[in-house]
Amino acid sequence: QSPIFGPQDVSSIEGNSVSITCYYPDTSVNRHTRKYWCRQGANGYCATLISSNGYLSKEYSGRASLINFPENSTFVINIAHLTQEDTGSYKCGLGTTNRGLFFDVSLEVSQVPEFPNDTHVYTKDIGRTVTIECRFKEGNAHSKKSLCKKRGEACEVVIDSTEYVDPSYKDRAILFMKGTSRDIFYVNISHLIPSDAGLYVCQAGEGPSADKNNADLQVLEPEPELLYKDLRSSVTFECDLGREVANDAKYLCRKNKETCDVIINTLGKRDPAFEGRILLTPRDDNGRFSVLITGLRKEDAGHYQCGAHSSGLPQEGWPVQAWQLFVNEESTIPNSRSVVKGVTGGSVAIVCPYNPKESSSLKYWCHWEADENGRCPVLVGTQALVQEGYEGRLALFDQPGSGAYTVILNQLTTQDSGFYWCLTDGDSRWRTTIELQVAEATKKPDLEVTPQNATAVIGETFTISCHYPCKFYSQEKYWCKWSNDGCHILPSHDEGARQSSVSCDQSSQIVSMTLNPVKKEDEGWYWCGVKEGQVYGETTAIYVAVEERTRGSPHINPTDANARAKDAPEEEAMESSVREDENKANLDPRLFADEREIQNAGDQAQENRASGNAGSAGGQSGSSK
């Protein structure tokens, strides 16, 4: 399929002008290469009429132009003073020859329609209302008024002042006078449908003294707005239907031959094919709304229509707006995993691509919710605090310049299953959808922390160990202190007098963190994790409680210690950084030699973890998982 896109059918009237926009993929080569407009001949040859190289054919001289808009990845062909001879098949395209990339366009130029003298032309869109003005002389002020529609030679009455209304105009047509006006009557026809188009005659009085006016009504199908989007990107349909339908249910549907299948409406209907990747946003009280679809697929290309009706379904005679969506498969958006799988108690690291030209943009991660219109509350962002209920288990790691950021979610529960969106406040095309599937764990987690009774005493030394399997042997291990603006990896060199170290026990694949001496500010969530360069892997979390040194301090149950996270005071939740100048972390690669497991510690951790789960609520278990 050619990545060039434009209008398939263009129609106009003799003497008028047309403007044809053609879209091309946003690449440097495409921006600079030759653009052309040629006419397809019967012999298969396409004769150039105009090109961006400056060529202009004789028949287009003085009436056509071709303008490239590289910033929009479009070029526009303007043709004026159209004649019926311009009717034909054309191509708009790119390349040094007319056999390059192109899109076929059919142009039809019709004769100017002929109407009886003094015919007033009314042009209205489907679903709208027309007001036909009928003038009469004073002599017919008290005579019967009527509006009829010409059908061949006959003229069938639509409505008259005796309150007759043709059944096909029932509840749609009204005849009225305005104020004190004695020389005009009006006929309103609402909810216009294509078959309403035609020639109307309004009349006041009977016989030769009657006053007659001709009105030609043209009912226009909505001209589809062309939307050119990359595969995996997102599209927004901005729908503005007007105040008159502000209180009616809204919908977006996709045309399918004769029908239009609803994709989403404000009454809660949603096509399963768009689950997790669609949002409908009411914009204001004037009937405006927008529908956002992310993760565009090849099969999403097609004709779309938005509308309003109390049923939330397409209805003839109600206003609509139309689009034609083209999905360019030559996408700049990288193909990332659309489904990520995790297990309860485990973690996931989700890589979110963004436009590399916008590394300073703010990054966000939201959870798509299937309420009636769909919504996506932001859970974390570069300038957004972690959503309540996700403290200690969610962090966003920006990797400037890499064109991606990573979101890590740990302490997974089955309730975390669902759809999530990666997005930035920059290029809105780069919105990707990920489905997270969390299954019940069937084995021990890869990372385990001991002790699970993580209570440190101020002024003393506190060591916590993270057990990892041999498969992580070659990966970098780290401890980080979680805060509301990320998880700050503990520094790997001494930046202060205080001893806080991370070391690995050669005999048992352990990476340990030591706080020495413990301070009140050390309280909070700590993560143990593995990574390879900027690729983050498994993590596990533990809440370290800090208490004053007291004689005969009671032993705190690990469940209680970790449950504090849920009720952590705001100051703790808001803590913004690890005191890097006072923490030291040493990860010595020489210490990762032995592949022996410590069975007992593992079994003990498993047992404690189970009790930790039992005492937690809302999937926010504080125990190390």
């Epitope: 703010l362 919504r375 996506c376 300038q383």
Partner: nanobody, 131 residues
């Protein structure tokens, strides 16, 4: 409920600058779109500037465009109004306002210049520009 406290007002000469701050209480600051309004003596309160909850979208009254800049620091629960090239007609009490929009993708770019759409208001800070 959020409490808003404005500061940074004062007396300044025409052509000078001031930076107003509005500190908000509570953890959910980043679920509010924020705005600045002002009221000159004997006049109606009028819109000055607004910023979306992400900080990614801003809007200004025509009279201050190019001179005033609104910004926010969600980590500090604070919204700022940098006022440069001040004119005597900028003299007014400046109010900070918050609109509850929720931290949602659908409200990422929402800013409002309409007084009635704001849910919480500060007490105001006086700005006087002398000629």
């Amino acid at each position: 409920e959020v409490q808003l406290v404005e500061s940074g007002g004062g007396l300044v000469q025409a052509g000078g600058s001031l930076r107003l701050s509005c500190a908000a209480s509570g953890r959910t600051f980043d679920s509010y779109a924020m705005g600045w309004f002002r009221q000159a003596p004997g006049k109606e309160r009028e819109f000055v500037a607004a910023i979306s909850w992400t900080g990614g979208s801003t809007d200004y009254a025509d009279s201050v465009k190019g001179r005033f800049t609104i910004s926010r620091d969600n980590a500090k629960n604070t919204v700022y109004l940098q006022m440069d090239s001040l004119k005597p007609e900028d003299t007014a009490v400046y109010y900070c306002a918050a609109e509850v929009v929720g931290r949602d993708v659908t409200t990422m770019y929402r800013v409002s210049g309409l007084e009635y759409e704001y849910d919480y208001w500060g007490q105001g800070t006086q700005v006087t520009v002398s000629s």
